[in-house]
């Protein structure tokens, strides 16, 4: 099977299998520096469920900015340029990390925390109830 | 005017505005009770930009499996639901946070690691390059 | 000390491209969003884009295709680059950080540099 | 894009005065709205922030007030060296936008 190796110069903590309180490293290390950054920007005017950016601010978060998708339209945006009520424009979501200050208004004293935000919109097919 | 409070137990800590190793506490806290997941469980297959969820996982990084979006389609599922080449299918992506384990194999010490995911698809109107 | 500083060529012709340099030093470009701004010679301000701390960008829709916003955070330094440029384009460009103690805001500006679009 | 209605785009006050200047934006901006203030020749200086934050080092006279859609900026008694052109700035929403400034001169 695989075994996991573990490494002898590790700091010291009581519970080896989930440790409840860990130290962390706010030194961010970024993984994306070979993309594009412009590789995705203007989606969310091109989209057929275009979206605006709106702000949610939380100090006591980290990151205490985060920017959210709200779908311009009920309906999606048909080959006219005209929104077709026939579809929906729908959030796409996703749970995050972030860390919450603990107790609050600590610099150094986190909790890890999950949390739902909307990431872009997506055109779908609507789900047709009909009535008996 | 804003008053920006400080609570008098935190622990202690030698930069007070950006630290750079912080305790974590990894019982995590789930803001998301109250919504359904279910609620966009099924966006991917009703978008007329449909996407497949792949797995990504790896042991040295909480979490340790994240479910990655790939589009099925380089264009888009129209009204008859044939794939649309004159539309684009493309992913929305959203940088996330990680713990990375730091050094590595080490249960209780991480870094904390800025990863780029794609969530799910989009559809798009192409840029059209016009060749003078 | 916070300090931003633009750099750029000053005068470019008409449908030519530009690049202005903003260089930042006392703080750490992976740490802080930078935003773009400019200003029209005698009108008012008006935002260009952001270059988020993990390096995404978001920028205005009317200039989106003509204009990139990319960083080197090892050099301190972001990049604002301007394609078919026009005169139009003529105006102060200024780089400021969003930072704050609590909230967040535009706390530090550049002093501007300033484009001239002309033949 | 949530447009910024700045009033008035000009106004003559003594000195000592109180002053107060208004932006109305055109969607809830849930009080993401900064002031600045602008002197010839030189980059705008951020004097409020999130619509009531005194930014460090900005002399208390200055304030500013609102929500949803309607802001104030007010000065409470005039000095000669608050001369000059303010603007608010909306940051709720993508694009960021300004109004379109207030030149403020001496009476």
């Known amino acids: 099977g695989i075994t996991i190796p573990r490494n002898p110069g590790c700091p010291n903590s009581e519970d080896k299998n989930f440790p409840r309180t860990v130290m962390v490293n706010l030194n961010i290390h970024n993984r994306n520096t070979n993309t594009n950054p412009k590789r995705s920007s203007d989606y969310y005017n091109r989209s057929t469920s275009p979206w605006n950016l709106h702000r949610n601010e939380d100090p006591e978060r980290y990151p205490s900015v985060i920017w959210e998708a709200k779908c311009r339209h009920l309906g999606c945006i048909n080959a006219d340029g005209n929104v077709d009520y026939h579809m929906n424009s729908v959030p796409i979501q996703q749970e995050i990390l972030v860390l919450r200050r603990e107790p609050p208004h600590c610099p150094n004293s986190f909790r890890l925390e999950k949390i739902l935000v909307s990431v872009g919109c997506t055109c779908v097919t609507p789900i047709v109830h009909h009535v008996a | 005017g804003i008053t920006i409070p400080r609570n008098p137990g935190c622990p202690n800590s030698e930069d007070k505005n950006f630290p750079r190793t912080v305790m974590v506490n990894l019982n995590i806290h789930n803001r998301n009770t109250n919504t359904n997941p279910k609620r966009s469980s099924d966006y991917y297959n009703r978008s007329t930009s449909p996407w497949n969820l792949h797995r990504n996982e790896d042991p040295e990084r909480y979490p340790s499996v994240i479910w990655e979006a790939k589009c099925r389609h380089l264009g888009c599922i129209n009204a008859d639901g044939n794939v649309d080449y004159h539309m684009n299918s493309v992913p929305i992506q959203q940088e996330i946070l990680v713990l990375r384990r730091e050094p590595p194999h080490c249960p209780n010490s991480f870094r904390l690691e800025k990863i780029l995911v794609s969530v799910g698809c989009t559809c798009v109107t192409p840029i059209v390059h016009h060749v003078a | 000390q916070v300090q931003l500083k633009e750099s750029g060529p000053g005068l470019v012709a008409p449908s030519q491209s530009l690049s202005i340099t903003c260089t930042v030093s006392?703080?750490?470009?992976?740490?802080?969003?930078i935003h773009w701004l400019r200003q029209p010679p005698g009108k008012g301000l008006e935002w260009l884009g952001v270059?988020?701390?993990?390096?995404?960008?978001h920028s205005d829709s009317a200039l989106m295709s003509r204009l990139s916003i990319s960083k080197d955070n090892s050099k301190s330094q972001v990049f604002l680059n301007v394609h078919s440029l026009r005169p139009e384009d003529t105006a102060i460009y200024y780089c400021?950080?969003?930072?704050?103690?609590?909230?967040?805001?535009?706390?530090?500006w550049g002093q501007g540099t300033t484009l001239t679009v002309s033949s | 894009d949530v447009k910024m209605t700045q009033s008035p785009s000009s106004m003559y006050a003594s000195l000592g005065e109180r002053v107060t200047i208004t932006c109305k934006a055109s969607?809830?901006?849930?009080?993401?709205l900064s002031w600045f203030q602008q002197k010839p020749g030189k980059s705008p200086k951020t004097l409020i922030y999130?619509?009531?934050g005194l930014v460090d080092g900005v002399p208390s006279r200055f304030s500013g007030s609102g929500s949803g859609q309607d802001y104030s900026l007010t000065i409470s008694s005039l000095e000669y060296e608050d001369m000059g052109v303010y603007y608010c700035?909306?940051?709720?929403?993508?694009?960021?936008?300004f109004g379109a400034g207030t030149k403020l001169e001496l009476k």
């Open positions: 006392g703080f750490s470009l992976i740490n802080y969003d």
């Open positions: 969607h809830d901006i849930n009080s993401y």
């Open positions: 700035l909306q940051y709720e929403m993508l694009p960021l936008t």
């Open positions: 999130r619509a009531n």
């Open positions: 270059i988020w701390a993990g390096g995404r960008t």
């Open positions: 400021a950080r969003e930072g704050g103690d609590y909230y967040k805001y535009l706390d530090f």
